[in-house]
Structure formats: C-alpha cells, structure tokens
C-alpha cells in the first residue's frame, strides 16, 4: 500500500486490479449505446479528465526514484472517474442494466483507489469539477467519451503497475 513516507504499494495486487479495470472498461464501452459520433462536440465534463503525462514520474526511471508522484497522479484519476461514474451521467436515463459492467467498473475504481490510499493517509486530490446536472439526451455521448478516456487512463495505469510488480516489488 502507498503510505506516508513513500513506502511501496502492493504492486502485484495493484497490477491485478488494474488489469481487471482494463477488461471492465473495454467491456463497458460498447454497452453505453451505439453512437453516431458525427454529432460529437466538446463537452465540459470530459475536457478536464486526468491524463498521465511525461512529468508525472510514471516512466521507469521516475518510478525507481520516487513512485509516490506517479501513484498520487493515478489515485487522483481513479477518484475523478469514480465520481463521474456515480454522477447522473451514469445513474440517470437511459438506465444502465442492473448487471452492467459499469457497476463493476465503478466498484473496482474505488477498490484500487483505496488500495493506493488507505484510511488515515490523505493525498491532496485534484479538484473534482462540480458536475452540473446533465440533460438526459447528452448522457449517451458523455458516457461514450468518459469511458473512452477511462480506457486510455487505466491502460497506462496497468502498465505502471505491471512494471512495478516486475521490477519494484520487494
């Protein structure tokens, strides 16, 4: 677990859960509705989604030097997407099926974020945008875009944890 003082997370556990997240993100994506993306426009909800960038210390050298920078960035992203998946974008009409992978995806995001930040340790979280209610007609497109960017995010996170499990585990 990532705890104060920079000790290592449970890399193998994180690797397993992040791989599960990748699978869920891909299985959820086609189920949010068939979209004709000719109508795709800029949506404020998806403009500021977290991305893992070069300066975030998620490269092999950065992870060796101090994995905390990268892990904090991943944690911020997990919390961001967890909030989005709990918003009316996903809970409102059109209703998701009760057994939709989005529900499992949501729970797994929460699980990995808790694995990275146990109780009693508080990283500074990135400002979560206060989500104004989405109009029902916007939601299918918003879901599509959110899940597409989440796929990219968890793919990078999974690579980070795979590298950590292979080279940084005690």
């Amino acid at each position: 677990r990532a705890v104060p003082g920079g000790s290592s997370p449970a890399w193998t556990q994180c690797q397993q859960l992040s791989q599960k997240l990748c699978t869920l993100a891909w299985s959820a994506h086609p189920l949010v509705g068939h979209m004709d993306l000719r109508e795709e426009g800029d949506e404020e909800t998806t403009n500021d989604v977290p991305h893992i960038q070069c300066g975030d210390g998620c490269d092999p050298q950065g992870l060796r030097d101090n994995s905390q920078f990268c892990l904090q960035r991943i944690h911020q992203g997990l919390i961001f997407y967890e909030k989005l998946l709990g918003s009316d974008i996903f809970t409102g009409e059109p209703s998701l099926l009760p057994d939709s992978p989005v529900g499992q995806l949501h729970a797994s995001l929460l699980g990995l974020s808790q694995l990275l930040q146990p109780e009693g340790h508080h990283w500074e979280t990135q400002q979560i945008p206060s989500l104004s209610p989405s109009q029902p007609w916007q939601r299918l497109l918003l879901r599509f875009k959110i899940l597409r960017s989440l796929q990219a995010f968890v793919a990078v996170a999974a690579r980070v944890f795979a590298h950590g499990a292979a080279t940084l585990s005690p």
Epitope: K83, S87, G92, P94, P98, L140
Partner: antibody, heavy 115, light 113 residues
Framework: EVQLQQSGPELVKPGASVRMSCKAS????????IHWVKQKPGQGLEWIGY????????NYNENFKGKATLTSDKSSSTAYMELSSLTSEDSAVYYC????????WGQGTTLTVSS | DIVMSQSPSSLPVSVGEKVTMSCKSS????????????LAWSQQKPGQSPKLLIY???TRKSGVPDRFTGSGSGTDFTLTISSVKAEDLAVYYC?????????FGSGTKLEIK
C-alpha cells in the same frame, strides 16, 4: 420485486413544513435517480425534481426551488422530500418514481394543508 | 420548457374497440445519434398511482399487455390500444424526459361507453 414504499398521509397547518419518505427495495438504491412528482386533486402531473442517491446530487424544477428539498439516506435506501412554508396550493398527492425508463412509482403520499 | 399536448382530453370507447390517442411536443424528443425518442406513456387508474406502459416512445415495459403500442418520432406520438378492455379505463399521460424540467401532457381520459 422492485418497490417504492411511501410514507402515510399528512395533515398539516399552513406555514408549517413536512417531510415525506420513499423507501426503495428490490434493486440497488444508488443505481438510479429518484424523481418526485406532484398531482393536485383532479389534475395532471408536475415534475418536482430528482435526487441521485449515490452522491446526493439534486436537480429541481425552477417552480419548486425554495419549496422542496430532496435528500436521501443510503443506509436505509430511503429518499426524502421536505416541503416548507406550506399553503393550500401544496395540498396534493406526491409520488416518488425511479428513472422513467425503469418506471417504478411509489403509491403516493397525500398532503392536506388546512387550518 | 417543453410543452406536451395531448388529444383528445376525453375518449369514450366501447369494449373491444381500437383506440388511438395523440401526444405532441413543442420540440423534438429524438436524439438522432442514438435514434432514441425520450418519451414515455403512463396509465393512471382511478385512485391509483401512475404506471409506466411505454418508454423510448415504443418500448413496452415488461408485463404490459401487447394490446398497448407506442409509435411516433420527433414531435408526434401515438398510443394505440388494439382492443380495449374494461380494465383499461384510466387517464393516459405522455411525458418527456429529453430535457429538464421533465414535463407531462394533461392526459387523455379513456371512458367506457
């Protein structure tokens, strides 16, 4: 079986407040929004607003801002609506309902405002 | 706000008859990317709470008899009952969930002759 069970009838005096409840069962409470709808005697239906039980996010019809306050309690799978500064115009049956494409309605709570 | 207009307001019918009622919206309820119309029909029997019959303009809710059919797109919608039964005596409301605030039609009251 999905059910939305609403609290019983209320008789209150003008100027008072009232809180009614809507207890959900048979599904994951945080999966859908809970909408509230007003129906005055012999009249049609008017949407009040919704609450998202997952994060307590709300969205109100402008006509009910300042009149209705929506809250929820995840631990008991219950949504609440409080109506304040009551007048005879607030006498109506109030329904809670799940997402419109899921389509479950409570049985309604009758509110009578009278001195 | 989107205005929903229903006609007729009252509809006297005989048991076994086919009936249609109309619902018009002041703006389109069709989201073209998904080809979904954000319109529902509900039935309210005397002294009861409303009950969903049709959503997405034409999808019958599970358990609703197949004599109820929803059709239409954009701004013009129809609810058809192919062969009215005495138990269908009710007020039928259309309502839109395309944008907030959600709005309802004033209802069509089905009366048995």
């Amino acid at each position: 079986e999905v059910q939305l069970q609403q609290s019983g009838p209320e008789l209150v005096k003008p100027g008072a407040s009232v809180r009614m409840s809507c207890k959900a069962s048979g599904y994951t409470f945080t999966s859908y929004l809970i909408h509230w709808v007003k129906q005055k005697p012999g009249q049609g239906l008017e949407w009040i607003g919704y609450i998202n039980p997952y994060n307590d996010g709300t969205n109100y019809n402008e006509n009910f801002k300042g009149k209705a306050t929506l809250t929820s309690d995840k631990s008991s799978s219950t949504a609440y609506m409080e109506l304040s500064s009551l007048t005879s115009e607030d006498s109506a049956v109030y329904y809670c309902a799940s997402n419109w494409d899921v389509g479950y309605w409570g049985q309604g709570t009758t509110l009578t405002v009278s001195s | 706000d989107i205005v929903m207009s229903q006609s007729p307001s009252s509809l006297p019918v005989s048991v076994g008859e086919k009936v249609t009622m109309s619902c018009k919206s002041s703006q389109s309820l069709l989201y073209s990317s998904s080809q979904k119309n954000y319109l529902a029909w509900s039935q309210q029997k005397p002294g009861q709470s409303p009950k969903l019959l049709i959503y997405w303009a034409s999808t019958r809710k599970s358990g609703v008899p197949d004599r109820f059919t929803g059709s239409g797109s954009g701004t013009d919608f129809t609810l058809t009952i192919s062969s009215v039964k005495a138990e269908d005596l009710a007020v039928y409301y259309c309502h839109q969930y395309y944008s907030y605030p959600f709005t309802f039609g004033s209802g069509t009251k089905l009366e048995i002759k």
